[in-house]
């Protein structure tokens, strides 16, 4: 699933949370809510797909309850009045445990997948296109809420024209209940339309004969350092990589490398000892010329958390830190699909990785 045109995620939002769904719900939109059920207070939490922020019009109320053996209530609220409850008497959530909760909007229903298994389908009682807000409340701590549009990369290499004028950058860090829509990459005054050559091929026997490999997310908090993982399918235009973590208080340096075999296609190297963010490429153990220019001050701070979003485009990588575009790095290794390994090391603690 490509991220072109997808709304940026809300990272670690405070609960209760209400945030805008840009463009409202669409057929094929997938929304992932990732978090942990609190083990202490409260016996319920809820995810609501609603119109506006009042809570009077909720198209889909998904409400796990740790009561009477555990069950999940699904319902719709119209003009402040609840309809008949639909109950699922199996509880896929556990107190104190993390969860991965995915909602897929389809023309007839919401499908809900919990921890990799289809959990429930909820048939629409009101038109889903009225929904423009997601809210979460109750006994839960959120890691992120992410959005995936139904646009996929073609099966065969093809030329396609994809507008990149929609937000593809991190939102501001949550401050209160309401979340403003995410910011956008700095763009030309007119929306940019680029010709993208999709060259990613699926491996023989791969389950789905499409290079639109879904984002892979890795569990918090078990991140060995250095952290190394495969980027399934490698890079391709619209591919996103998302990392968040905390810089150690005594940090000197850390690095994020995108690798192709023995080469480092992209070396992102914040250096606190030099107050610089160095970018480079290493081919056959030989480093190229460093890039260091920044549009503003060093965005990484010792002892503070950070988020990095790397967006692959046809000609360059775009990198945003803490919701703000930082730089572009033009591809020096241009065989994007072979750039299929992520390596993170140095003086940080990772809290979230999505490739």
């Amino acid at each position: 699933m490509a991220f072109s045109g997808s709304q940026a995620p809300y990272l670690s939002p405070a609960v209760p949370f209400s945030g805008t769904i840009q463009g409202g719900l669409q057929d094929g939109l997938q929304i992932t809510v990732n978090g942990t059920v609190l083990s202490s207070s409260g016996t319920r939490f809820a995810v609501n797909f609603q119109t506006g922020f009042s809570g009077n019009d909720i198209a889909f109320h998904f409400n796990p309850r740790f009561e009477d053996g555990g069950y999940v209530v699904c319902n719709t609220r119209q003009n402040g009045s609840w309809g008949p409850e639909e109950r699922k008497t199996h509880m896929p959530f556990q107190k104190g445990m993390p969860f991965d909760l995915c909602f897929l909007v389809q023309s007839s229903d919401f499908k809900v997948m919990v921890n990799g298994i289809l959990f429930v389908q909820y048939f629409h009682r009101v038109p889903f296109h009225r929904v423009d807000t997601i809210s979460v409340n109750g006994s839960v701590q959120l890691s992120y809420i992410s959005f995936q549009n139904p646009r996929t990369v073609p099966v065969q290499p093809a030329f396609s024209t994809v507008p990149f004028s929609q937000p593809v950058c991190f939102p501001p860090r949550p401050r209160g209940r309401r979340q403003k829509p995410p910011g956008v990459w700095p763009a030309n005054p007119a929306p940019i339309t680029q010709t993208v050559i999709h060259t990613v091929q699926s491996a023989p026997g791969q389950m789905f004969s499409t290079p639109a490999i879904p984002p892979m997310m890795y569990p918090h908090p078990a991140y060995p350092m250095p952290f190394i993982t495969t980027i399934l399918g490698g890079l391709y235009p619209s591919k996103s990589i998302l990392l968040s973590g905390t810089v150690l208080p005594s940090a000197q340096r850390f690095h994020i490398n995108l690798c192709s075999g023995n080469h480092i296609a992209f070396h992102l190297n914040p250096r606190f000892d030099e107050n610089a963010v160095v970018r480079n490429t290493q081919i056959d153990n030989s480093w190229g010329s460093e890039e260091r220019s920044l549009p503003r001050k060093m965005p990484f701070v010792r002892g503070q958390s950070f988020s990095v979003w790397i967006l692959c485009e046809a000609h360059c990588l775009k990198v945003a830190v803490d919701g703000q575009h930082l730089f572009e790095y033009y591809h020096r290794l241009r065989n994007l699909p072979t750039i299929n390994r992520l390596e993170v090391g140095g003086d940080i603690q990772l809290t979230h990785v999505q490739t």
Partner: antibody, heavy 125, light 109 residues
Framework: EVQLVESGGGLVQPGGSLRLSCAAS????????IHWVRQAPGKGLEWVAY????????SYADSVKGRFTISADTSKNTAYLQMNSLRAEDTAVYYC??????????????????WGQGTLVTVSS | DIQMTQSPSSLSASVGDRVTITCRAS??????VAWYQQKPGKAPKLLIY???SLYSGVPSRFSGSRSGTDFTLTISSLQPEDFATYYC???????????FGQGTKVEIK
């Protein structure tokens, strides 16, 4: 290339224990759900357990609940099935399988797309 | 538990025949159904996922369909390599999130 390789099977006495391993390559177990499925001699497929390492969630068939424990070591890219209090009826070939679930073309897709070769567990005195 | 009742348990057919195997779910499982082929001494192989989608590399003579809680695997023209046992499988969260059908053995007539 995606591959799953099981190991750890063998002959064990009733009441004994075994630990099966499922080593994955070509993908990360932390981004998939891993299932154990068994097949008694001459019988059909029976689902045993699964783990969703991303959230740590586990689920078990009633027939093994309280006796078997599924786990995963993401640093080793390996899933495990710890089998305690084994019974004769646990005799089977045990397969691990990757279960793919993600959205494609506005729909979700489900299926166990890769399986290991299987490892035989024989419980007999 | 959600039960998957598969029929027939076995059938005899000739090369070139059209073969149909059905599975009925005891309750709604949406389209979260897959079909597998297994040959003696081998691991199962995925044929159909999400009730009707053909897995990569599987010949187009295999197809799957859904009507409510009834799921069908069809082999349009049986080939010699198709003689095997076929299983349906559902994955819809219940007390057991995964259940298999009992299997259908396709034998040479």
């Amino acid at each position: 290339e995606v591959q799953l390789v099981e190991s750890g099977g063998g002959l064990v006495q009733p009441g004994g224990s075994l630990r099966l391993s499922c080593a994955a390559s070509g993908f990360t177990v932390s981004s998939s759900s891993i299932h154990w499925v068994r097949q008694a001699p001459g019988k059909g497929l029976e689902w045993v357990a699964y783990i969703y390492p991303y959230s740590g969630y586990t689920s078990y068939a009633d027939s093994v609940k309280g006796r078997f424990t599924i786990s995963a070591d993401t640093s080793k890219n390996t899933a495990y099935l710890q089998m305690n209090s084994l019974r004769a009826e646990d005799t089977a070939v045990y397969y691990c399988a990757r279960y793919s679930t993600y959205s494609s073309s506005s729909k979700w897709v489900w299926g166990m797309d890769y399986w290991g070769q299987g490892t035989l567990v024989t419980v007999s005195s | 538990d959600i039960q998957m009742t598969q029929s027939p348990s076995s059938l005899s057919a000739s090369v070139g025949d059209r073969v149909t195997i059905t599975c009925r779910a005891s309750q709604s499982v949406s389209s979260a159904v897959a079909w597998y082929q297994q040959k003696p001494g081998k691991a199962p192989k995925l044929l159909i996922y999400s009730a009707s989608s053909l897995y990569s590399g599987v010949p187009s003579r295999f197809s799957g369909s859904r009507s409510g809680t009834d799921f069908t695997l069809t082999i349009s023209s049986l080939q010699p390599e198709d003689f095997a046992t076929y299983y349906c499988q559902q994955s819809y969260y219940d007390s057991n999130p995964i259940t298999f059908g009992q299997g259908t053995k396709v034998e040479i007539k």
